[in-house]
Amino acid sequence: KFSKQSWGLENEALIVRCPRQGKSSYIVDWYYSQTNKSIPTQERNRVFASGQLLKFLPAEVADSGIYTCIVRSPTFNRTGYANVTIYKKQPDCNVPDYLMYSTVSGSEKNSKIYCPTIDLYNWTAPLEWFKNCQALQGSRYKAHKSFLVIDNVMTDDAGDYTCKFIHNENGANYSVTATRSFTVKDEQGFSLFPVIRAPAHNETKEVEIGENTNLTCSACFGKGAQFLATVQWQLNGNKITDFSEPRIQQEEGQNQSFSNGLACVNTVLRIADVKEEDLLLRYDCLALNLHGLRRHTIRLSRK
């Protein structure tokens, strides 16, 4: 059946997303499968449902089991299963395989280690990072947003990396840790001055007032793994995060690799319920790497 494994440690927060994704307007009901008992939605409960999310604040070993989520649209009900296992904290430093998230590979040019599942939590930077249980210190390690960047990666940087952060729920703080292996691969590649594939410079996109629209900023940075390559949107020269308009959201950049080996990144700007004032803004697609910055501007016009 449509199920997903989730795991956590006792006395830490664990948030699980229903494997059955639906539109945000759809109702989601959660049940404990063994008893068919409904999970409460009141936040005063230690375990409660919040739309697509099931929250254990904090988790206990006894919470382990299969949870059913039913996502209800006006015409369809779709069921997903979350197989949750809560483990006791390990007394020693060793992180067992069953607590490990997927392994990531890096190279001299690209050493990003993303903190698994962090997007489900309400956390604030900076993250704490540990390698083989030792806190990472020194200028080679940079905690950036939800990932760790290691400068001048060497083979002995391989190992198990744990991120630790605090989830905040209604003023209460809960600790979360997640561990994944990092392997180092030797990769021949090169980087170029960024090339923006989309949008074209000074492009105009026709939009409907009241509709949703997406703008994609797509840029390539060379061949093989890239050490620093970011693609982002700016509004009137300001970062999206500094532009306090919840209707306008930027997705985290998605890496893309083409058959010709080019390393490219796509970042989507989502504009919900387009308004007249959005047509007055200048939308800048910025591509930045070690070689420099390239900018393409796009404007919106009424259809």
């Epitope: 059946k1 994704q21 639906g22 015409t75 369809f76 994609t216």
Partner: antibody
Framework: EVQLLESGGGLVQPGGSLRLSCAAS????????MIWVRQAPGKGLEWVST????????AYADSVKGRFTISRDNSKNTLYLQMNSLRAEDTAVYYC????????????????WGQGTLVTVSS | EIVLTQSPATLSLSPGERATLSCRAS??????LAWYQQKPGQAPRLLIY???NRATGIPARFSGSGSGTDFTLTISSLEPEDFAVYYC?????????FGQGTKVEIK
């Protein structure tokens, strides 16, 4: 009541072009992904193309990639399929259909279908 | 792409009999599988979604089962209007693919 009505089919020579339309009513058109599916005479169903609700994301079957273009006009509640460089093997009844669930990057079933429009590619 | 193979190609049965149709996927589709019914000159009609859930308005005599790679559509007691072609479809990944169809005909 949900209704989908295709039009624009007909006889066309190999290498020619045709534009199919699908007029939608009875639902909030812009909230749904739309799909073209075809069925060659006496044969099974073949997915042709999908377009997301906002119109920005499209996907195509390999057999039509580079020749067909799916588009939509949400203000007119209309779905289109522009077919260029037509071949004999494109001969089929073309159905437009609605995906009632669709979330980013995922697909679902087709709950409403039009009655279909026949495209014949022949010299 | 995921290939769906339906069997048998044709099923010859009488009204009141039980019909069992099979659909096998070339790789796991979890339960992202649907069944459609198509009558001559008509568009397909959705019967079953997520392998085992009946769509709105579909009679209880239609049921679906299976998960992963092997799926079954069962019609518990055939009515005269059930004689048609049945297609399975996967939607776990693009391209969306359909089986080649099973024709249920009157014996």
């Amino acid at each position: 009541e949900v209704q989908l009505l295709e039009s624009g089919g007909g006889l066309v020579q190999p290498g020619g072009s045709l534009r199919l339309s699908c007029a939608a009513s009875g639902f909030t058109f812009s909230s749904y992904d739309m799909i073209w599916v075809r069925q060659a005479p006496g044969k099974g169903l073949e997915w042709v193309s999908t377009i997301r609700g906002e119109g920005g994301t499209t996907a195509y079957a390999d057999s039509v990639k580079g020749r067909f273009t799916i588009s939509r006009d949400n203000s007119k509640n209309t779905l289109y399929l522009q077919m260029n460089s037509l071949r004999a093997e494109d001969t089929a009844v073309y159905y437009c259909a609605r995906d009632p669930w669709s979330t980013e990057g995922s697909f679902f079933v087709l709950d409403y279908w039009g009655q279909g429009t026949l495209v014949t590619v022949s010299s | 792409e995921i290939v769906l193979t339906q069997s048998p190609a044709t099923l010859s049965l009488s009204p009141g009999e039980r019909a069992t149709l099979s659909c096998r996927a070339s790789q796991s589709v979890d339960d992202d599988l649907a069944w459609y019914q198509q009558k001559p000159g008509q568009a397909p009609r959705l019967l079953i979604y997520d392998a085992s859930n009946r769509a709105t308005g579909i009679p209880a005599r239609f049921s679906g089962s299976g998960s992963g790679t092997d799926f079954t559509l069962t019609i518990s007691s055939l009515e005269p209007e059930d004689f048609a072609v049945y297609y399975c479809q996967q939607y776990i990944t693009a391209p969306l693919t359909f089986g080649q169809g099973t024709k249920v005909e009157i014996k």
